[in-house]
């Protein structure tokens, strides 16, 4: 009886099971009863990354400068290249297509975690007791100045934005 | 049990025609492909043609393309090879084989064709 | 086509030796080859099927290896009706092809 299903790392055509082609190879024939699957490895700059029947080797993937993206790791026979971003910027997606720049955390926000190659800059407001009064990709929200361990006074409350201003202490004369 | 018994070979002219016929038996003809190899005296095997078990794919090496012809008869249980404008180089014995597992897993007697004037 | 190259043309070995044929394709053929035994006046028979796997009915002392370009035909210990001529045969693709054949003959 005609096979209706096939073993794993097989397919079904004309009534038989054929060997699927390796990772890094292409399908050129079909197998026959009398002969297996003929296929071929894929090219320079081309790829199969699964057991296939595929009669054309993907493309890898260009990492084009002019959007921002260099090569993290070169493509091989059967992997795709992987693109990053060049410093400075991230991906814009997880297939990493292009790339924007990081964005700064503005006075009042501090990096809570520093963007790379593939996720951007997260920001948080700095809380009670930390300020920060640059627009920065890196900079944290810094403890406002204890005036009391320099054995000075707050003379001027500090905000998110601002340290706070010593003073020296009003003398009892 | 397994039988492929080849007749048809004889001593033919060059130029002229010779068809082999090979009776199989012991086992569900139309279910297998079936090929022809022959051997020169004293020389190594060489693959001539084969069919596929429904009759629908044959397969022929570029020298005898054209030439040769592979059929089957699967009501008679009787595979066929029509060869025409013999030539010399055609004296071999000729064997008939079943594909099995993609392999030639049985094989016949073989018949001796002569192609002398 | 797929050139397939055995090697030696005879090998001379004495019953109870061991001896190792080898058959070399002219490009990869992964492991889509055959072996078969022919004894003077006989037709082939399959041996090997698929570079190592064992055919039912085949003595335990034929065994096959390789994969790619380089394979070995091993008969373990030679027994006198194994003096015979061995083919290989390569299925990967069109048109069939065989080696030319390894005589081993009684030294």
């Known amino acids: 009886e005609p096979p209706t299903a096939c073993r794993e790392k097989q397919y079904l055509i004309n009534s038989q099971c054929c060997s699927l082609c390796q990772p890094g190879q292409k399908l050129v024939s079909d197998c026959t009863e009398f002969t297996e699957t003929e296929c071929l490895p894929c090219g320079e700059s081309e790829f199969l990354d699964t057991w296939n029947r595929e009669t054309h080797c993907h493309q890898h993937k260009y990492c084009d400068p002019n959007l921002g993206l260099r090569v993290q790791q070169k493509g091989t026979s059967e992997t795709d290249t992987i693109c990053t971003c060049e410093e400075g910027w991230h991906c814009t997606s997880e297939a990493c297509e292009s790339c924007v720049l990081h964005r700064s955390c503005s006075p009042g926000f501090g990096v809570k975690q520093i963007a790379t190659g593939v996720s951007d800059t997260i920001c948080e407001p700095c809380p009670v007791g930390f300020f920060s009064n640059v627009s920065s990709a890196f900079e944290k929200c810094h403890p406002w100045t204890s005036c009391e361990t320099k054995d000075l006074v707050v003379q001027q409350a500090g905000t998110n934005k601002t340290d706070v201003v010593c003073g020296p202490q009003d003398r009892l004369r | 049990e397994v039988q492929l018994v080849e007749s048809g070979g004889g001593v033919v002219q060059p130029g002229r025609s010779l068809r082999l016929s090979c009776a199989a038996s012991?086992?569900?003809?139309?279910?297998?492909?079936m090929s022809w190899v022959r051997q020169a005296p004293g020389k190594g095997l060489e693959w001539v043609a084969s069919?596929?078990?429904?009759?629908?794919?044959?397969y022929y090496p570029d020298n005898v393309k054209g030439r040769c012809t592979i059929s089957r008869d699967n009501s008679k249980n009787t595979l066929y090879l029509q060869m025409n404008s013999l030539r010399a180089e055609d004296t071999a014995v000729y064997y008939c084989?079943?594909?099995?597992?993609?392999?030639?897993?049985?094989w016949g007697q073989g018949t001796l064709v002569t192609v002398s004037s | 086509e797929i050139v397939l190259t055995q090697s030696p043309a005879t090998l001379s070995l004495s019953p109870g030796e061991r001896a190792t044929l080898s058959c070399r394709a002219s490009?990869?053929?992964?492991?889509?080859l055959h072996w078969y035994q022919q004894k003077p006046g006989q037709s082939p028979r399959l041996l090997i099927n698929?570079?190592?796997q064992s055919i039912s009915g085949i003595p335990a002392r034929f065994s096959g290896s390789g994969s790619g370009t380089d394979f070995t035909l091993t008969i373990s210990s030679l027994e006198p009706e194994d003096f015979a001529v061995y083919f290989c045969?390569?299925?990967?693709?069109?048109?069939?092809?065989f080696g030319q054949g390894t005589k081993v003959e009684i030294k």
């Open positions: 012991g086992f569900t003809f139309s279910n297998y492909g």
């Open positions: 490009q990869s053929i992964r492991d889509n």
């Open positions: 084989t079943r594909a099995g597992g993609k392999a030639m897993d049985y």
């Open positions: 045969q390569q299925f990967n693709s069109w048109p069939l092809t």
């Open positions: 069919i596929s078990s429904g009759g629908d794919d044959t």
């Open positions: 698929y570079a190592s």
